[in-house]
């Protein structure tokens, strides 16, 4: 007798790993024999799809090699024309052992920055990710966290964070380990012991010490008055990432000696500097109330203006007087590019001699101000038009910067050459040519490239750094 189909083994949920076999069974009793069709997520599975095996008149559906995308609801429908069609459904849950899809890579990072070691995983159930440093599980702390993605984030990287890391992805089906990667922490060059200034007698020997550290270990170079040290012997030793350099000098003139520690981070370099002065006792005896010291000018901007080997006053109210004063002239120098050919050399001479004042070595190194007459010559003769324009702008408050730019000297406050010819400095460039009183000897101007540090406001009585002047 005809019998409507009955599914005697309803479909069950099937768990399968990727690449495994998964079989659904839909045993049907009926007469005549039913036609059985299969769907996945309500889409008909075609009999000729070679990824599937349909056996026993459609009662067994096998996925021969499960893929991620096979996850879903599978239904069998049996129909033999007697009564209605019957259906049974079951889920295929594709399980997956943990797999690390984006493993960590070796990282070089500078101390203090944030490091992220990637570890992206796949798996079902979703794997939990932990990290191993060296041979021990890594404990999370205020700086270290395992992100939702599995990546390891380390804030404010410290030297002790360096080491070997690997991530571990784990679920109920298994565990996957990444390869071991290295976190290298690099540290900017830093001076541990700066050279000390010395006041010695002419012809003495002096040893300057400079100790620096960093990762990688920095190299130390010595600079004497702006140039590489030409004489003297250097001895170096390295121990436990600390480099110690000793420069031995035979002193015949005063000088500024700078120790520069440099190390490389990829394509970039980090440097640390420390300077010491070596003065000769007869030239200047440092006192408590010193405002600065005498040293040879070794900048670039005023090379053409100042006399060769000029002894200039370096104002110690700046952390790095040479660099600070050089920056002052450099910044103002750029503004002089647009002034008239008559004004420019005079203004440059005034600028350089005002910032790098001639220095009188003695018991207390003293700056020698520019003679009032020379200042007035620039103001009223060479640069009258520009000076007026600049004063107008100053009154309108157009110059606000307290840093980096030089104020115009107040000519009236400068000493006159008629009072004491030795109390003020002359500007040789402004001495009149008898044939043409408004000509100057030819001058070269150059724009050196200067690194711009953060400058402190000057507390010097010799010159101030407010408000700006421009001769345009």
């Amino acid at each position: 007798l005809p019998k409507a189909p009955v599914i005697t083994t309803p479909l069950e949920t099937v768990d399968a790993l990727v690449e495994e076999v998964a079989t659904f069974m839909c045993a049907v009793e009926s007469y005549p024999q039913p036609e059985i069709s299969w769907t996945r997520n309500k889409i008909l599975i075609k009999l000729f799809d070679t990824r599937y095996s349909i056996r026993e008149n459609g009662q067994l559906l096998t996925i021969l090699s499960v893929e991620d995308s096979d996850d879903g609801i599978y239904c069998c429908t049996a129909n033999n024309g007697v009564g209605g069609a019957v259906e049974s459904c079951g889920a295929l849950q594709v399980k997956m052992k943990p797999k690390i899809t984006r493993p960590p890579i070796n990282v070089k990072i500078i101390e203090g920055l944030k490091a992220v070691l990637p570890c992206t995983t796949m798996g079902n159930p979703k794997p939990s990710v932990s990290w191993i440093k060296g041979d021990s599980p890594l404990r999370e702390n205020s700086r270290t966290a395992v992100l939702e993605s599995g990546s390891l984030r380390i804030h404010n990287v410290q030297k002790e964070d360096a080491g070997q890391y690997r991530c571990v992805a784990k679920n109920s089906l298994g565990t996957a380990y990444s390869k071991v990667v290295k976190l290298e922490v690099e540290v900017f060059a830093r001076i541990l012991r700066a050279p000390e200034s010395h006041n010695v007698t002419f012809g003495s020997f002096v040893t300057l010490h400079c100790t620096a550290t960093g990762i990688p270990v920095p190299t130390i170079t010595w600079i004497e008055n702006g140039n590489a040290v030409s004489s003297g012997s250097i001895q170096e030793s390295v121990k436990d990432r600390v480099i110690d350099s000793r420069l031995q000098l035979f002193i015949t003139k005063p000088g500024l000696y700078t120790c520069i520690a440099t190390n490389k981070h990829g394509e970039k370099f980090s440097t640390a500097k420390a300077a010491a002065t070596v003065s000769i006792a007869e030239w200047s005896k440092p006192q408590k109330d010193n405002k600065g010291y005498c040293a040879q000018y070794r900048g670039e901007v005023c090379n053409a203006v100042l006399a060769k080997d000029a002894l200039v006053f370096l104002n110690t109210s700046y952390a790095d007087p040479e660099e600070a004063q050089e920056l002052l002239v450099h910044t103002a120098w750029n503004e002089l590019k647009v002034v008239s050919p008559l004004c420019r050399p005079a203004a440059e001479a005034l600028l350089c001699n005002h910032v790098f004042q001639e220095c009188s070595p003695g018991v207390v190194p003293t700056p020698i101000p520019i003679c009032r007459e020379y200042c007035l010559a620039v103001k009223e003769l060479f640069c009258a038009k520009e000076w007026l324009a600049m004063e107008e702008k100053t009154h309108r408050g157009l110059y606000r910067s307290e840093m980096h730019l030089l104020s115009v000297p107040e000519c009236s406050k400068l000493p006159s050459m008629h009072w004491d010819p030795t109390a003020c400095a002359r500007l040789p460039h402004l001495d009149y040519n008898k044939e043409n009183p408004k000509t100057f000897p030819p001058m070269t101007s150059s724009k050196p490239s200067v690194d711009i540090p953060n400058l402190p406001s000057s507390s010097s009585s010799s010159f101030s750094v407010s408000p700006t002047y421009s001769m345009t």
Epitope: T8, T9, E12, V14, D15, A16, L17, E20, V21, T23, M25, A27, S53, I54, R55, E56, N57, Q59, L60, T62, L64
Partner: antibody, heavy 121, light 107 residues
């Protein structure tokens, strides 16, 4: 009574061919999946091949795929195994078995007595 | 392919003993596991199908259990006629596979 009788075994040289037959009786042959299973001397059972009740699907073990061919003639109640490119490791007793669908997959509820195939030079 | 691993490969026991043979599948095979008995020179004989269903005509001292990957065949009280080789088989995949066999010998 269900009966399965194999024939066609014998001695054959490596590279040679042989055709095994299995005559079925006592049941509706056309309603069952049929399989071949072999057993090398002193070894365990090894499934060889399977064919659906109306020949709609065929499966082979990796070790014989491309060399053996399973077929059936429902009109004659017969199952066949054509064996080509025979190798020494094909030496075994070959059984035909009936596949029965149950609540969880199929099982071999009836077996023939087997036929010995010897591949040797 | 799905591998079926039987243990032990051989076993000595006495009449009346309780014996357990295990079979492990290389992946989950639901309950699609069958057990066969084979005596020397004879064809295999079906004992248990669908992991735990006793085939008609097989003594009740034979029982099967398991699901997923781990299966067992138990003989509750060994009889002299039970000394033979036992095989598990999976039919979850259309590419069926057998375990390597467990030879049960008289102690």
């Amino acid at each position: 009574e269900v009966q399965l009788v194999e024939s066609g075994g014998g001695l054959v040289k490596p590279g040679g061919s042989l055709r095994l037959s299995c005559a079925a009786s006592g049941f509706t042959f056309s309603s069952y999946t049929m399989d071949w299973v072999r057993q090398a001397p002193g070894k365990g059972l090894e499934w060889v091949s399977s064919i659906g009740s109306n020949g709609d699907y065929i499966y082979y073990a990796d070790s014989v795929r491309g060399r053996f061919t399973i077929s059936r003639d429902n009109a004659k109640n017969s199952l066949y195994l054509q064996m080509n490119s025979l190798r020494a490791e094909d030496t075994a007793v070959y059984y035909c078995a009936r596949g029965q669908l149950a609540v969880a997959g199929t099982h071999f509820d009836y077996w023939g007595q087997g036929t010995l195939v010897t591949v040797s030079s | 392919d799905i591998q079926m691993t039987q243990s032990p490969s051989s076993l000595s026991a006495s009449v009346g003993d309780r014996v357990t043979i295990t079979c492990r599948a290389s992946q989950k095979v639901n309950k699609y596991v069958n057990w066969y008995q084979q005596k020397p020179g004879k064809a295999p004989k079906l004992l248990i199908y669908a992991a735990s269903t006793l085939q008609s005509g097989v003594p009740s001292r034979f029982s099967g259990s398991g699901s997923g990957t781990d299966f067992t065949l138990t003989i509750s009280s060994l009889q002299p006629e039970d000394f033979a080789t036992y095989y598990c088989q999976q039919s979850y995949s259309p590419l069926s596979t057998f375990g390597q066999g467990t030879k049960l010998e008289i102690k």
